[in-house]
Interface confidence: low
């Protein structure tokens, strides 16, 4: 008898008008439920109205949800990206600030006459870190030559050295090695450490990028209505006390968050290789040491050469000629006291290890973050029941909810009872992340072993050459393919192919 | 092949405001820094504006600094820029260029052009 | 600033050379690309692009080198088409942004 089924629909007043929605379309009484769309068609208390009102909210509702998970690990992936960061820029400014404040002194004129020099070589070094299109070899490579030209012509100011004689000392300096090892030394080191550090902080980066980019992928029409029927139907149905079941909860959003879910492995990947990178922090080539005590090798480069200077100007002139005597310059240079050299290795200020350990702790946290997401919405945002399986909302009724809980996944959702997905229709922004997540997971493999990843030219023809030596097996198992760097978030800049060992320069 | 097409040229007013618009095909449009070049009657080409590949990073020529402003949507594969307060020496042939890679900053954009529009006539009088 | 110089003539087949220059004594490790504009009004082509790299529809008569802070476009066996104004690009460290320098007009 309609009569006796005819409750009153106080409750799912309350809990629509809580919702800012308009009590006049709220029935007084059950009616009859034929025009309901997404909940079953018993009586209820909803109107067709009503019912498309908190769908739309339901949906808006774990969109919210959604983007407050995403934005928490955006955060804190954002935090420690901008601690690496000034860490980083620190040491290099630490350093270029003890030049500045050491070298006059230490080297008068050979120093201040070329003090631009070294600030642009600081510059570039920024650059270089930040993401530039340098190639730090070249980029050394061109300062010690100017170097070598301006002190050359400033140790002999009684000769006259014209363009072409320059140009053959130029030539020549390969050979004469006329800063020692410093430069060597200098160019391994900065490419192993400005790889590693830029690498992992843009690691960060394209972590954070993804994040945001999934967060941002709307949820389709199926989502929505599973959703609704979890949340809301109940209330509609004369039974709003009964939360959904726990094992309901997960279906439905395991098939919402499917494409999402698709990110594990690769997003796993990311953090293993970024976790791996920071062993590459510590030593006499880490990035402390290095990226601090840039100064203590141009030091050492200039007292090489005022070392060899004699020796040096023989074997020019044996190679290039007897250069003309300048008869205004003045006699040659006296020969300079030596600048004092700061202790190579730096001691560790103990930041470093502090930003590593935590970084580590907290990627590790975050490593099942995708697959875990069903799971943790569901029990953070969902208001699941606590009470026995027979009295929780199944989608249906209150009772017991009788399908078994879907895999992780797309390809997993194809039997899944609560929302239809296509698994054959991945989502494109996903795939592309996966994509952005495989190419920086890449990159920090190859900076493990020290190189800068050899990108594509702009033909886009796929082409490009393999890393150098020296592979961990448990990096080269799961290498992968790296010619695909033309699709790439704002993070993943294309660098210059640089190879760091000695010889071997791929550009 | 790529193909950039450039419109919203014409005669304009001193003291108003350019919209141009660069419609890009035929390469991944998002993973590219592009920019706009200009060229006066009779001159040479000046640098107008770059921007990096997500947007996130811009130069502009000093003639048109704190009167323009570029902008790209990648979705749509379009660059855009905007020129207040025209002067008659705004008039000439804006290109939009695409850069054949960048890093955020796009401090070299003028030397790694690869690809030029046909370019948009723009007369202020 | 980039200075080029204003004019360069040749030959065909002869070998051309057309430098570009930038200002300050040093320049860091800058890009330099080289542009060609065959009349005023037409859009320019690039022929060289980060120092020496060359478009795959361009010829390889056409080449690139920098020593310093000075760029070279190469044209070796110039060719009555090579006729045309040549601008190159960089960085202008100043304004923090893109310059070209004022044009070579090349004459065969």
């Known amino acids: 008898d309609p009569a006796s089924k005819s409750r009153s629909c106080g409750e799912v007043r309350q809990i629509y008008g809580a919702k800012g929605f308009s009590l006049s379309d709220v029935p007084q009484a059950e009616i009859s439920g034929e025009h309901l769309r997404i909940c079953p068609q018993g009586y209820t208390c909803c109107t067709s109205e009503m019912e498309e009102n908190l769908a739309n909210r339901s949906h808006a509702e774990l969109e919210t949800a959604l983007r407050d998970s995403s934005r928490v690990l955006q955060a804190m992936l954002a935090t420690q990206l901008r601690s690496f960061d000034d860490h980083f820029q620190h040491l290099l400014n630490d350093s270029e600030r003890t030049l500045q404040a050491t070298f006059p002194g230490a080297f008068g004129e050979l120093y201040t006459q070329n003090a631009r020099a070294f600030r642009d070589l600081y510059s570039e070094l920024r650059l270089y870190y930040r993401g530039a299109n340098l190639h730090l070899e070249e980029t050394l490579a061109e300062f010690w030559a100017r170097l070598l030209e301006r002190l050359f012509k400033q140790l002999h100011p009684q000769l006259l050295l014209p363009d072409d004689y320059l140009d053959c000392l130029g030539k020549q300096a390969e050979a004469l090695r006329p800063f020692g090892e410093a430069p060597r030394e200098l160019r391994l080191r900065a490419t192993r450490a400005f790889v590693a550090a830029r690498s992992f902080v843009q690691g960060l980066g394209v972590a954070s990028d993804v994040v945001r980019k999934v967060a941002q992928v709307p949820l389709g029409p199926e989502c929505s209505r599973a959703v609704m029927k979890l949340v809301y139907c109940a209330h509609c149905l004369g039974v709003p006390g009964a939360r959904p079941c726990p094992d309901y909860c997960r279906n439905v959003l395991k098939g919402c968050l499917a494409n999402q879910a698709d990110l594990d492995a690769e997003w796993r990947n990311l953090l293993d290789s970024m976790v791996l990178i920071t062993d590459k922090f510590w030593g006499t080539s880490g990035v402390e040491s290095v990226i601090g005590s840039v100064h203590t090798w141009l030091a050492e480069a200039i007292n090489a050469l005022q070392d060899n200077r004699d020796t040096l100007t023989a074997k020019v002139i044996q190679g290039c000629g007897n250069p003309k005597v300048n008869p205004q310059g003045p006699g040659p240079e006296e020969k300079r006291r030596r600048g004092k050299l700061a202790p190579r290795e730096r001691p560790p200020s103990g930041t470093l290890e502090k930003l590593v350990s935590e970084a580590k702790a907290q990627l590790r946290d975050v490593q099942d973050f995708w697959i875990s997401l069903p799971g943790t919405l569901c029990s953070e945002k969902m208001a699941l029941s606590t009470a026995s399986d027979d009295r929780c909302w199944n989608g249906m009724a209150r009772g017991r909810y009788l399908p078994e809980v879907m895999g992780d996944g797309l390809a997993n959702q194809i039997n899944n009872p609560e929302v239809e997905v296509d698994i054959t229709k991945p989502d494109m922004t996903i795939r592309q992340q996966i994509m952005q997540l495989k190419i920086m997971t890449n990159r920090l493999r190859s900076a493990y072993n020290g190189n800068d990843v050899d990108f594509q030219d702009a033909s886009d023809d796929g082409s490009g050459s393999g890393s150098g030596d020296g592979c961990l097996d448990d990096l080269c198992s799961r290498k992968v393919s790296r010619k695909s760097s033309s699709s790439r978030t704002p993070l993943t800049h294309a660098l210059p192919g640089l190879s760091e060992q000695e010889g071997q320069k791929t550009s | 092949a790529v193909t950039l097409d450039e419109s919203g040229g014409g005669l304009q007013t001193p003291g108003g405001a350019l919209s141009l618009v660069c419609k890009a095909s035929?390469?991944?449009?998002?993973?590219?820094?592009m920019g706009w070049v200009r060229q006066a009657p009779g001159k040479g080409l000046e640098f107008v504006a770059s921007?990096?590949?997500?947007?996130?990073?811009?130069a502009y020529g000093s003639a048109v600094k704190g009167r323009a402003t570029i902008s790209r949507d990648n979705r749509q594969s379009t660059l855009r820029l905007q020129l207040n307060n025209l002067r008659a020496e705004d008039t000439g042939t804006y290109y939009c260029?695409?850069?054949?890679?960048?890093?955020?900053?796009?401090?070299?954009?003028?030397?790694?052009?690869?690809?030029w529009g046909h370019g948009t006539e723009v007369t202020v009088s | 600033a980039l200075t080029q110089p204003a004019s360069v003539s040749a030959n065909p087949g002869e070998t051309v050379k057309i430098t570009c220059s930038g200002s300050?004594?040093?320049?860091?490790?800058?890009?330099y690309g080289w542009y060609q504009q065959k009349s005023p009004g037409s859009a320019p082509v690039t022929v060289i692009?980060?120092?020496?790299k060359r478009p795959s529809d361009i010829p390889s008569r056409f080449s690139g080198s920098t020593s310093g802070s000075t760029a070279t476009l190469t044209i070796t066996g110039v060719q009555a088409e090579d006729e045309a104004v040549y601008f190159c690009?960089?960085?202008?460290?100043?304004?923090?942004?893109?310059?070209f320098g004022a044009g070579t007009t090349l004459t065969v």
């Open positions: 260029a695409k850069s054949y890679r960048c890093s955020w900053n796009c401090w070299d954009y003028a030397a790694k052009i690869d690809a």
């Open positions: 035929g390469f991944t449009y998002s993973s590219y820094a």
């Open positions: 921007i990096s590949s997500d947007g996130s990073d811009t």
């Open positions: 300050g004594s040093y320049t860091g490790s800058y890009y």
């Open positions: 692009y980060n120092n020496n």
């Open positions: 690009g960089s960085y202008d460290r100043s304004s923090d942004s893109g310059i």
